[in-house]
Interface confidence: medium
C-alpha cells in the first residue's frame, strides 16, 4: 500500500491487547515516518522512523518503554525492511530484517487502546502524547499484520494498492502534476542569504500556482504563479507587498527554463534566460520560512493566506493546481525530485501531458540543446567583456575586465585566505582614481562545499566585502571537508566611486573564482551495522562478515584497508576458515567481505573483540564488539517418523526431522547421533557432497545440513517376512556446541 505523506488507515481494536505480534514491511526514503500507532487515552504503542532509525514507544500506565535500532543502520534507504515486534509474557522484542535489535521487560498489564490502530499516520487524532511524533509515512507498507490480522484491508481512496513508482523516482524524473488538486510539498525554502528556485516548466495552464513558501509570524510569504499565461512573483513582508511580472509567455505546452532568485535586496524571475527584477532599493529583508515549500498547488492554509491578501486570485483559481510538469527542479542549488517530497497529491512520476501535446514537431526546435548539461553555466565566458564608452580617461584604454582571477587553493577541510593575488586588478587603481574600498565584491552563488567567511561586521549576512578587506585578510574560505577536488564561487564585482569609468563597472561584472581542493587522507572508521553486540552459542563458531562490522573510509577502497585485532594473540577467537586453530590477528577488508573469518568460542566467558582499521597511512580509533556466549537451547521442531515398504529406502527430510536453536543470526552446526542399535535396517549418508550417483554409506551420525540437502536416508534391510508392520525405534541425540539433547 502507498502512503503519500498525509494519509492513514484506521483499524478498530475490540479488546485490550494482552499479547502483541506485530509484523510490518515498509520502504521509504524519508528519515521521518509514522508507521503505526495503537492509541488509548494514555496507553499507546508507537512505531516511527525518526532520523532514519526505528523507534518503538510503549506506554503502559505510567511506565514508558523505548526500543530503537542502532544509529549506524538507517532504514530510510528506500529498501523494504521487515520489522517484527512481539510483546509476550512481560517481554518485548524488536527485530529488523531478521536481526534482534532490542528487547526489554515490560509491565504485565494489557495495552488498553480503545481508539484503535492508526497505520501510516494519526489523522486528526488530538492526543497529548502525539506532540513531537514523526510526519505521516511517505512510502510503502508492503505488509502489516497484528496478531495475524491484516492492517491493510480495506484501503481508503487516498491510500493506493501496491508501491507507487514516484517513491523510487530519481531526481531526473519530472514532477507530473495531473490535477485538479495536485500538490507536492518539500522541505522549507530558506532565503536567509539568498534563495533560488529553478525548474523547467511545461504546461498549458494560463492560471496556476507554481510555488508557495509561508514565512514569519505576520502572514509573510513568497508566491510564484502563472497569471494570464505569464510568470508572476509576489513577496509579502510585514512592510508591504512586492509584485513582479515576467513578459515571456509560458502557457504554450513547450518547456521553459524558470529561475526565481531572491535576496535581501532584490527579487528576480527569469524565463528562458530573460530576467525581470525589482530595483536594488526594494529592500525585501529576510523571510523566515514556516512550513513546507508547496509546488504546483496550494493547501487550505496557503489558499487562505492568498485570499486574505486579495491579490486578484479568485477562489476557483486558488483551489486549482498546475496541469503540467516540472523538470530539473533545484532549490537553493540542490536537486530535488519526487523522492525528496514530504507529501504529494495526485502526482505522477514523469512528464505525461495530454496526448495533443505530443505532436511530432512540438520539441523539434529544442533538439539542438538536448545535450546541454544543466550545470553548463560555468562554461560561459565570465566576466562578459566590457566595452568602455568613448571619452574615458586613458587608463581605461583597451579595458575589458577589472580583475585577473587566480584559483584559490585550500586543503580538504581547511581554510585559505582570499588574497590580492586571487583577484588582482588589471589596471592601476590610483591612476583610475579608485580606492580599494570602492571595489565591492558580492557573492552571488556560494561554493557547493564551503563557506566564504567574512570578518567584517554585518558582512556575513550581506555576503559583501571590498578589495580593501581582501588586502586586510578579512575574507577566508572554509572548506567543509568533502571529497570533491574542485569548486567555485561566483562573485559580482562593482565599483562604487563617482569618477569617470566604464558603466559596466557601475553595473557590476560577474567572475568565477575557481577553488582547488587539495585532498587530505581521512582516517577510516569501524561501524557495526547491527549494533556492537554479537551473540554466539557456547562452543560454536560464527562467521564474521560485513554484517557484523565494516570499515568506512570516504577516500580509500576496500583493497587498501587492513584490520588489526588488538589484545594478546594467544587464545584469540578470530580465525580464518581455511586455517582453523590459528589466530588471525590481522586480516584484509577483502577477506572480511569474502566471509573468510570466523569467531570461535571455546568455552568460558566470550572474549570481546577490539579492532582497529588502517588505510596504510592512518588508523581508526579502536572499536569494540561485545560478544556474549549463550548456552545453546535445542528444541525439536519436527519428528514425524517414516513409513516405507520393506526392502526399500526413504530419505529423511526436514519435514520429518528438524530442530530449532536459540542462535541469533548464526548458522550453527547441529549434529544427530544414533544412540541405540537398529533392528530392521540402517541409517545411511550419501558421500561426495551429495552428487547424483554418489554412494550411500551406513552412518551413526549426521548433521542437520545433511538432512536439508537430502543426503540422509533409512534403508530397510530386514529379509524376514512379517505378518504385521514392523516399527524401528530410532534413538537419537542432538548436539549443538557441547549441549546435548537425548532421547529424541
Amino acid at each position: 500500500a502507498s502512503f503519500f505523506g498525509e494519509n492513514h488507515l484506521e483499524v478498530p481494536v475490540a479488546t485490550a491487547l494482552t499479547d502483541i505480534d506485530l509484523q510490518l514491511q515498509f520502504s521509504t526514503s524519508q528519515p521521518e515516518a509514522l508507521l503505526l500507532l495503537a492509541a488509548g487515552p494514555a496507553d499507546h504503542l508507537l512505531l516511527q522512523l525518526y532520523s532514519g532509525r526505528l523507534q518503538v514507544r510503549l506506554v503502559l500506565g505510567q511506565e514508558e518503554l523505548r526500543l530503537q535500532t542502532p544509529a549506524e543502520t538507517l532504514l530510510s534507504d528506500s529498501i523494504p525492511h521487515t520489522v517484527v515486534l512481539t510483546v509476550v509474557e512481560g517481554w518485548a522484542t524488536l527485530s529488523v530484517d531478521g536481526f534482534l535489535n532490542a528487547s526489554s521487560a515490560v509491565p504485565g498489564a494489557p495495552l488498553e487502546v480503545p481508539y484503535g490502530l492508526f497505520v501510516g499516520g494519526t489523522g486528526t487524532l488530538g492526543l497529548p502524547y502525539l506532540r513531537g511524533t514523526s510526519r505521516p509515512l511517505r512510502g510503502c507498507l508492503h505488509a502489516a499484520t497484528l496478531n495475524g490480522r491484516s492492517l491493510l484491508r480495506p484501503l481508503t481512496p487516498d491510500v493506493h494498492e501496491g508501491c507507487a513508482e514516484e517513491f523510487s523516482a530519481s531526481d531526473d524524473v519530472a514532477l507530473g502534476f495531473s490535477g485538479p488538486h495536485s500538490l507536492a510539498a518539500f522541505p522549507a525554502w530558506g532565503t536567509q542569504d539568498e534563495g533560488t528556485l529553478e525548474f523547467t516548466l511545461t504546461t498549458q495552464s494560463r492560471q496556476a500556482p507554481l510555488a508557495f513558501q509561508a514565512g514569519g509570524r505576520r502572514g509573510d510569504f513568497i508566491y510564484v504563479d502563472i497569471f494570464e499565461g505569464h510568470l508572476r512573483a509576489v513577496v509579502e513582508k510585514g512592510q508591504g507587498t512586492v509584485l513582479l511580472h515576467n513578459s515571456v509567455p509560458v502557457a504554450d505546452g513547450q518547456p521553459h527554463e524558470v529561475s526565481v532568485h531572491i535576496n535581501a535586496h532584490r527579487l528576480e524571475i527569469s524565463v528562458d534566460q530573460y530576467p525581470t527584477h525589482t530595483s536594488n532599493r526594494g529592500v525585501l529583508s529576510y523571510l523566515e520560512p514556516r512550513g513546507s515549500l508547496l509546488l504546483g498547488g496550494l493547501d487550505a492554509e496557503a489558499s487562505r493566506h492568498l485570499q486574505e491578501h486579495r491579490l486578484g486570485l479568485t477562489p476557483e483559481a486558488t483551489n486549482a493546481s498546475l496541469l503540467g510538469c516540472m523538470e530539473d527542479l533545484s532549490v537553493n542549488g540542490q536537486r530535488r525530485g519526487l523522492r525528496e517530497a514530504l507529501l504529494t497529491r495526485n502526482m505522477a512520476a514523469g512528464c505525461r501531458l495530454e496526448e495533443e501535446e505530443y505532436e511530432d514537431d512540438a520539441y523539434g526546435h529544442y533538439e539542438a540543446f538536448s545535450t546541454l548539461a544543466p550545470e553548463a553555466w560555468p562554461a560561459m565566458e565570465l566576466p562578459e567583456p566590457c566595452v568602455p564608452e568613448p571619452g574615458l580617461p586613458p587608463v581605461f584604454a583597451n579595458f575589458t575586465q577589472l580583475l585577473t582571477i587566480s584559483p584559490l587553493v585550500v586543503a580538504e577541510g581547511g581554510t585559505a585566505w582570499l588574497e590580492w593575488r586571487h583577484v588582482q586588478p588589471t589596471l592601476d587603481l590610483m591612476e583610475a582614481e579608485l580606492r580599494k574600498s570602492q571595489v565591492l565584491f558580492s557573492v552571488t552563488r556560494g561554493a557547493r562545499h564551503g563557506e566564504l567567511e567574512l570578518d567584517i561586521p554585518g558582512a556575513q549576512a550581506r555576503k559583501m566585502f571590498t578589495l580593501l578587506d581582501v588586502v586586510n585578510r578579512k575574507a577566508r574560505f572554509i572548506h567543509d571537508g568533502s571529497e570533491d577536488t574542485s569548486d567555485q564561487l561566483v562573485l559580482e564585482v562593482s565599483v562604487t566611486a563617482r569618477v569617470p569609468m566604464p558603466s559596466c563597472l557601475r553595473r557590476g561584472q560577474t567572475y568565477l573564482l575557481p577553488i582547488q581542493v587539495n585532498p587530505v587522507n581521512d582516517p577510516p572508521h569501524i561501524i557495526f551495522p547491527h549494533g556492537s553486540l554479537m551473540v554466539i552459542l557456547e562452543h560454536t563458531q560464527k562467521p564474521l562478515g560485513p554484517e557484523v562490522f565494516q570499515a568506512y573510509d570516504p577516500d580509500s577502497a576496500c583493497e587498501g584497508l587492513t584490520f588489526q585485532v588488538l589484545g594478546t594473540s594467544s587464545g584469540l577467537p578470530v580465525e580464518r576458515r581455511d586455517q582453523p586453530g590459528e589466530p588471525a590477528t590481522e586480516f584484509s577488508c577483502r577477506e572480511l567481505e569474502a566471509g573468510s573469518l570466523v569467531y570461535v568460542h571455546r568455552g568460558g566467558p566470550a572474549q570481546d573483540l577490539t579492532f582497529r582499521v588502517s588505510d596504510g597511512l592512518q588508523a581508526s580509533p579502536p572499536a569494540t564488539l561485545k560478544v556474549v556466549a549463550i548456552r545453546p537451547a535445542i528444541q525439536i521442531h519436527r519428528s514425524t517418523g517414516l513409513r516405507l515398504a520393506q526392502g526399500s529406502a526413504m530419505p529423511i527430510l526436514p519435514a520429518n526431522l528438524s530442530v530449532e536453536t536459540n542462535a541469533v543470526g548464526q548458522d550453527v552446526s547441529v549434529l544427530f547421533r544414533v544412540t541405540g542399535a537398529l533392528q530392521f535396517g540402517e541409517l545411511q549418508k550419501q558421500g561426495a557432497g551429495g552428487v547424483e550417483g554418489a554412494e550411500w554409506w551406513a552412518t551413526q551420525a549426521f548433521h542437520q545440513r545433511d538432512v536439508e540437502q537430502g543426503r540422509v536416508r533409512y534403508l530397510s534391510t530386514d529379509p524376514q517376512h512379517h505378518a504385521y508392520d514392523t516399527v524401528e525405534n530410532l534413538a537419537l541425540e542432538v548436539q549443538v556446541g557441547q549441549e546435548i539433547l537425548s532421547n529424541l
Epitope: 506506554v59 511506565e63 509491565p107 497529548p128 502524547y129 502525539l130 506532540r131
Partner: antibody, heavy 121, light 111 residues
C-alpha cells in the same frame, strides 16, 4: 507512592563543580524522564534539561549546555546533575521533577524537595 | 524560545472571592488539538505542585475550585472561591517546544 529524595545543601567555592543527586522510588525509574529545574532566590523557575534513564538520552536548554551535565544510574534509581565552573549566578535551589509520560514531552507531576547550592568564597 | 508573560505580578483577594491570573505566550502553544500549557502552585520553601495540565485538565487530588481555560496564546487560571490555603505563587509553563519555559509568576495574597 512516588518519591524523589534530593541530596542536602551544598556550599561551594567559585570555579568549583557540584554534583547533586535525586533518588527515585515508587515507580519505574528507567522508563520516565527526569527533569531538572533551577530557581534563584526570590525568582522564577528555569528548565535546565531532562534525561531518559533507560538509555541515557538527554535534552538540554541551550542556556545550560556546557554548564549542567545530566546522568542517571539505573541500578540505584538515582539521577544526577553536575554543575561546573560555578559563579554567584549559579547560587539557587535546584529541583528534580519526574516527567509524566502521558503528556509528551512530559509535564512535571512529582518534584524533589530541592537542593540549595550556595556559591561563595 | 517561547516567552510567557504572567499578569498581574501580584494580587490580593478576599476569602471567598474569585482570583484570575492570566498568561500570554509569545507564540501559539497549540498542536494536535491540544494546548500545551500547564499551571503550578508554589509555596515558600516547597517545590512547585502541578495543578492544571493541558490548559484545562485538573490534576488528580487538586480541588475543583481551580480551573484553567484558553488556547493558542492566551490562558487563564481561575480560583473560585479563594481559600486561606491558596496563598502562594502561581506559574504557567509551556511544553509545546523545547526549551520548556515558565511564566514569571503571580503572587496571590489574601486581604
Amino acid at each position: 507512592q512516588v518519591k524523589l529524595q534530593q541530596s542536602g545543601p551544598e556550599l561551594v567555592k567559585p570555579g568549583a563543580s557540584v554534583k547533586i543527586s535525586c533518588k527515585a522510588s515508587g515507580y519505574a525509574f528507567s522508563r520516565s524522564w527526569m527533569n531538572w529545574v533551577k530557581q534563584r532566590p526570590g525568582q522564577g523557575l528555569e528548565w535546565i534539561g531532562r534525561i531518559y534513564p533507560g538509555d541515557g538520552d538527554t535534552n538540554y536548554n541551550g542556556k545550560f549546555k556546557g554548564k549542567a551535565t545530566l546522568t542517571a544510574d539505573k541500578s540505584s534509581s538515582t539521577a544526577y546533575m553536575q554543575v561546573s565552573s560555578l559563579t554567584s549566578v549559579d547560587s539557587a535551589v535546584y529541583f528534580c521533577a519526574r516527567g509524566n509520560t502521558v503528556v509528551v514531552p512530559y509535564t512535571m507531576d512529582y518534584w524533589g524537595q530541592g537542593t540549595t547550592v550556595t556559591v561563595s568564597s | 524560545d517561547i516567552e510567557l508573560t504572567q499578569s498581574p505580578a501580584s494580587l490580593a483577594v478576599s476569602l471567598g472571592q474569585r482570583a484570575t491570573i492570566s498568561c500570554r505566550a509569545s507564540e501559539s502553544v497549540d498542536s494536535y488539538g491540544n494546548s500545551f500549557m500547564h499551571w503550578y502552585q508554589q509555596k515558600p520553601g516547597q517545590p512547585p505542585k502541578l495543578l492544571i495540565y493541558l490548559a484545562s485538565n485538573l490534576e488528580s487530588g487538586v480541588p475543583a475550585r481551580f480551573s484553567g481555560s484558553g488556547s493558542r496564546t492566551d490562558f487563564t487560571l481561575t480560583i473560585d472561591p479563594v481559600e486561606a490555603d491558596d496563598a502562594a505563587t502561581y506559574y504557567c509553563q509551556q511544553n509545546n517546544e523545547d526549551p520548556l519555559t515558565f511564566g514569571g509568576g503571580t503572587k496571590l495574597e489574601l486581604k
